[in-house]
C-alpha cells in the first residue's frame, strides 16, 4: 500500500481466483484513542472500532472511503483504491491502445516545435467518475522539471456503439533550449482513477522525436504563362522554431482530386515555393517536416487548384 | 560564444555539402546496425544515450544562433578553447566566435573518427563479420574536416591488447552512431545557418 | 495485371511522321498519366512528354516541341505519338510507360522500334 | 534542363559482393530522385522511388539513399539476375531527365 495523495492510498493486488489479496492497517488521524467506530463509504454498518481497523483487501467490495467517528462526528477519512496486477502485469483498462507507432501506446504525444513545449493525448470510453492526474519530468534519476497543466477532456467521438473520449494535457519543460541535444528523455506519468480502480501509464520520449510541425501557412497559387503549371507558394507555420535557417523545414506538394486512389503530382523541395501541374477539381496540398531529423510530418495545408 | 549575422557571402560555404553527406552518411550507417543487429539493444529507446565530446567540446553552446543568445537555458558556462585558423570561413571578416564554432565542430568529428576507426578495427576481427563501419561515412568525415582544415594535434587511435568483446563493441557502436547522428544534425543546421546568413 | 502493349516497328524516311500507338488494359485508363520515353541503340533514356487521358493535358519536353504530338482516345484505351520531320537521329525504340504519379513510371510498354533511313 | 550524371559508367562486381552506383544532379532536386534496371531487350523496371523508397515486389537488397544532389543506389548482394543496366531519373522539374545509365557486369 503507498499513498497516492492525502487521505488517498492505493493497494497493489495480484489479481487472480482466490487470491488472498492484502491485510491493511488504517488508522484514525485523530489524538481520541477510544470510542472511534469504522464505516466504509455510505453504509451505517460498523466495521470495527479502535483507532487501527485491520481488514483485509481481495476485491472492489474491499475498496472505497472508509470514515473513523466518535459520537457522530467524522474524525478522518481514508480512500482505498486498488491496483491489479494480473499475471505480473499492471492492468490497463481505464484507457484504450492507440496501437500507434506500436501496441500498448496509451499515451500520445507530440510538440510543434522545440521550445519545450509539448502535448499528451490518450483515449478511453469510460464517461464518467474518472478523474486523470499528470507529471513529468526530464530524466528519471535527477529529474529536471516540467511543469504539466490539468488533463481536459479535449474530443468526443461516436466509433460505432460507443462514444470514445479524447483527454490531454500540456506541458512545458521549464529550462528549454530549442538547440539542445537531448541525452535524457522526457518522462511523463499519468495517474488514472476511475470509481476505486487505480491505474498508472507512463511514456518516455525525446522532443526530437514527437516533433510534429503545424501545416504551412499562407499558401498562394500563382499561374504560369502558356503553361498549365502553377508556381504555389507558402510560408513557415508561426509556431514552428527560429531561426528558420537554423531549424529548417522540407516540404511535400502535392496535387490530388478528393479520393486518395486518383492521380496525383507530387515533388519535395527544400524551399518556399515549387512548380506543380495543377488539374480541374484538384487541390493542391503542402505539408512539412524537420529538415534534418525525420520525425512526423505536418499535416496538410490545402487550396484549391482552380 | 554564438554565430554573429556578419558570416560568409551566401552560397561561398564550401561545408554545407559536406555536413548534407555527413548526415545522410552517419543516418544510413544507424539504420544497417539497427537492422544488422537487429537482436542487440540498438533503438533509440534500448541504448545509453552518451556524448564522446562531453566536457571536451561544446559544439551547441559555441555554434548557438543569434537569436537564441537571449534565452538563457542555452547559454552553458562550459568554457573551452580552441584553434581558430579554418578555410570554411571563406570570409576576412569572419568573427572570432565562427572559427570557435567550426573548431569546435572539427574536435568533434575528430574524436568521433578515432573512436570509428577503433572500432572498426575490432569489428574486423569479429569471426561472425557481422557488421563493419560503411567506408563512405568515414570518408565524409575526412572530407568535412579537410574542408574546415584546422589544425590541431593528431590524437593517437586507441589499440587494445586484451580480446575484444564483440558484443560489447557492436552496443557500443550503437551508442556512438545515435549520438553521432545527433551531433551531425547540429552540425547540419549550424552550416545551414552560416550559409543563409 | 495492368499492361501496355504498343504497335509494330516502324521504318520511315527522312522528313516524315510516325504514330505509335499504346494499349493499356487492366485498371481505368484515365486514372494514369502516360509518358512516352524513347532509347536510342545502345544510348539511353529521354523522356519526350505526357498526356492526361482524363482531359487530354499535355507537356512535351522543349527539345521536341513542336514536332512531338501525344494524344490518347478514352473509348478503346490506347495513347498515341507522332513525331513529325523525322531524322535518322530519331531511330529509336519509343517506349509509352504510365503511372498514377506525374513524374515517374511504374508500368512500361515494351518498345517499338522505329527506324529513319532514306 | 537538370542534367543527371552517373558513376561509374560501368561496374564490374562478383556474384554476392555489394554494389553502389552513383547519381549526381546538376542542381538541388531534394528528393525527387527514381531509380530503374534495365536488362538487354527488356523495357525498364522501377526500382526505388524518392530516393528511398522501396517499390513493392522489388527485392530488399535494393536501396537507395541520398538528397539535395548526391544520390546512390546499393545492392547488397548482387545476384545473377540483377546484372544489367541502371538508370537514374529525377522527377524536381520538368523535362524530366535521367541519367546516362550504369552497366552492372560480372567480374
Known amino acids: 500500500i503507498w499513498e497516492l495523495k492525502k487521505d488517498v492510498y492505493v493497494v497493489e493486488l495480484d489479481w487472480y481466483p482466490d487470491a488472498p489479496g492484502e491485510m491493511v492497517v488504517l488508522t484514525c488521524d485523530t489524538p481520541e484513542e477510544d470510542g472511534i467506530t469504522w464505516t466504509l463509504d455510505q453504509s451505517s454498518e460498523v466495521l470495527g472500532s479502535g483507532k487501527t481497523l485491520t481488514i483485509q483487501v481481495k476485491e472492489f467490495g474491499d475498496a472505497g472511503q472508509y470514515t473513523c467517528h466518535k459520537g457522530g462526528e467524522v474524525l478522518s477519512h481514508s480512500l482505498l483504491l486498488l491496483h491489479k496486477k494480473e499475471d505480473g502485469i499492471w492492468s490497463t483498462d481505464i484507457l484504450k491502445d492507440q496501437k500507434e507507432p506500436k501496441n500498448k501506446t496509451f499515451l500520445r504525444c507530440e510538440a510543434k516545435n522545440y521550445s519545450g513545449r509539448f502535448t499528451c493525448w490518450w483515449l478511453t470510453t469510460i464517461s464518467t467518475d474518472l478523474t486523470f492526474s499528470v507529471k513529468s519530468s526530464r530524466g528519471s534519476s535527477d529529474p529536471q522539471g516540467v511543469t504539466c497543466g490539468a488533463a481536459t477532456l479535449s474530443a468526443e467521438r461516436v466509433r460505432g456503439d460507443n462514444k470514445e473520449y479524447e483527454y490531454s494535457v500540456e506541458c512545458q519543460e521549464d529550462s528549454a533550449c530549442p538547440a539542445a541535444e537531448e541525452s535524457l528523455p522526457i518522462e511523463v506519468m499519468v495517474d488514472a482513477v476511475h470509481k476505486l480502480k487505480y491505474e498508472n501509464y507512463t511514456s518516455s520520449f525525446f522532443i526530437r522525436d514527437i516533433i510534429k510541425p503545424d501545416p504551412p501557412k499562407n499558401l498562394q497559387l500563382k499561374p504560369l504563362k502558356n503553361s498549365r503549371q502553377v508556381e504555389v507558394s507558402w510560408e513557415y507555420p508561426d509556431t514552428w522554431s527560429t531561426p528558420h535557417s537554423y531549424f529548417s523545414l522540407t516540404f511535400c506538394v502535392q496535387v490530388q482530386g478528393k479520393s486518395k486512389r486518383e492521380k496525383k503530382d507530387r515533388v519535395f523541395t527544400d524551399k518556399t515555393s515549387a512548380t506543380v501541374i495543377c488539374r480541374k477539381n484538384a487541390s493542391i496540398s503542402v505539408r512539412a517536416q524537420d529538415r534534418y531529423y525525420s520525425s512526423s510530418w505536418s499535416e496538410w495545408a490545402s487550396v484549391p487548384c482552380s | 560564444r554564438n554565430l554573429p549575422v556578419a558570416t560568409p557571402d551566401p552560397g561561398m560555404f564550401p561545408c554545407l555539402h559536406h555536413s548534407q553527406n555527413l548526415l545522410r552518411a552517419v543516418s544510413n550507417m544507424l539504420q544497417k546496425a539497427r537492422q544488422t543487429l537487429e537482436f542487440y539493444p540498438c533503438t533509440s529507446e534500448e541504448i545509453d544515450h552518451e556524448d564522446i565530446t562531453k566536457d571536451k567540446t561544446s559544439t551547441v553552446e559555441a555554434c548557438l544562433p543569434l537569436e537564441l543568445t537571449k534565452n538563457e537555458s542555452c547559454l552553458n558556462s562550459r568554457e573551452t578553447s580552441f584553434i581558430t585558423n579554418g578555410s570554411c570561413l571563406a570570409s576576412r571578416k569572419t568573427s572570432f566566435m565562427m572559427a570557435l564554432c567550426l573548431s569546435s565542430i572539427y574536435e568533434d568529428l575528430k574524436m568521433y573518427q578515432v573512436e570509428f576507426k577503433t572500432m572498426n578495427a575490432k569489428l574486423l576481427m569479429d569471426p561472425k563479420r557481422q557488421i563493419f563501419l560503411d567506408q563512405n561515412m568515414l570518408a565524409v568525415i575526412d572530407e568535412l574536416m579537410q574542408a574546415l582544415n584546422f589544425n590541431s594535434e593528431t590524437v593517437p587511435q586507441k589499440s587494445s591488447l586484451e580480446e575484444p568483446d564483440f558484443y560489447k563493441t557492436k552496443i557500443k557502436l550503437c551508442i556512438l552512431l545515435h549520438a553521432f547522428r545527433i551531433r551531425a544534425v547540429t552540425i547540419d543546421r549550424v552550416m545551414s545557418y552560416l550559409n543563409a546568413s | 495485371q495492368v499492361q501496355l502493349v504498343q504497335s509494330g516497328a516502324e521504318v520511315k524516311k527522312p522528313g516524315s511522321s510516325v504514330k505509335v500507338s499504346c494499349k493499356a488494359s487492366?485498371?481505368?485508363?484515365?486514372?494514369?498519366?502516360l509518358h512516352w520515353v524513347r532509347q536510342a541503340p545502345g544510348q539511353g533514356l529521354e523522356w519526350m512528354g505526357w498526356?492526361?487521358?482524363?482531359?487530354?493535358?499535355?507537356e512535351y519536353a522543349p527539345k521536341f516541341q513542336g514536332r512531338v504530338t501525344i494524344t490518347a482516345d478514352e473509348s478503346t484505351s490506347t495513347a498515341y505519338m507522332e513525331l513529325s520531320s523525322l531524322r535518322s537521329e530519331d531511330t529509336a525504340v519509343y517506349m509509352c510507360?504510365?503511372?498514377?504519379?506525374?513524374?515517374?513510371?511504374?508500368?512500361w510498354g515494351q518498345g517499338t522500334l522505329v527506324t529513319v533511313s532514306s | 534542363d537538370i542534367v543527371m550524371t552517373q558513376s561509374p559508367l560501368s561496374l564490374p562486381v562478383t556474384p554476392g559482393e555489394p554494389a553502389s552506383i552513383s547519381c549526381r544532379a546538376s542542381?538541388?532536386?531534394?528528393?525527387?530522385l527514381h531509380w530503374y534496371q534495365q536488362k538487354p531487350g527488356q523495357q525498364p523496371r522501377l526500382l526505388i522511388a524518392f530516393a528511398s523508397q522501396s517499390i513493392s515486389g522489388v527485392p530488399s537488397r535494393f536501396s537507395g539513399s541520398g538528397s539535395g544532389t548526391d544520390f546512390t543506389l546499393t545492392i547488397s548482394s548482387l545476384q545473377p539476375e540483377d546484372f544489367a543496366t541502371y538508370y537514374c531519373q529525377q522527377s524536381n522539374s520538368f523535362p524530366l531527365t535521367f541519367g546516362q545509365g550504369t552497366k552492372v557486369e560480372i567480374k
Open positions: 498526356i492526361d487521358p482524363e482531359n487530354g493535358d499535355t
Open positions: 510507360a504510365r503511372n498514377k504519379e506525374l513524374r515517374y513510371f511504374d508500368v
Open positions: 487492366g485498371g481505368t485508363f484515365s486514372d494514369y498519366y
Open positions: 542542381q538541388s532536386i531534394s528528393i525527387n
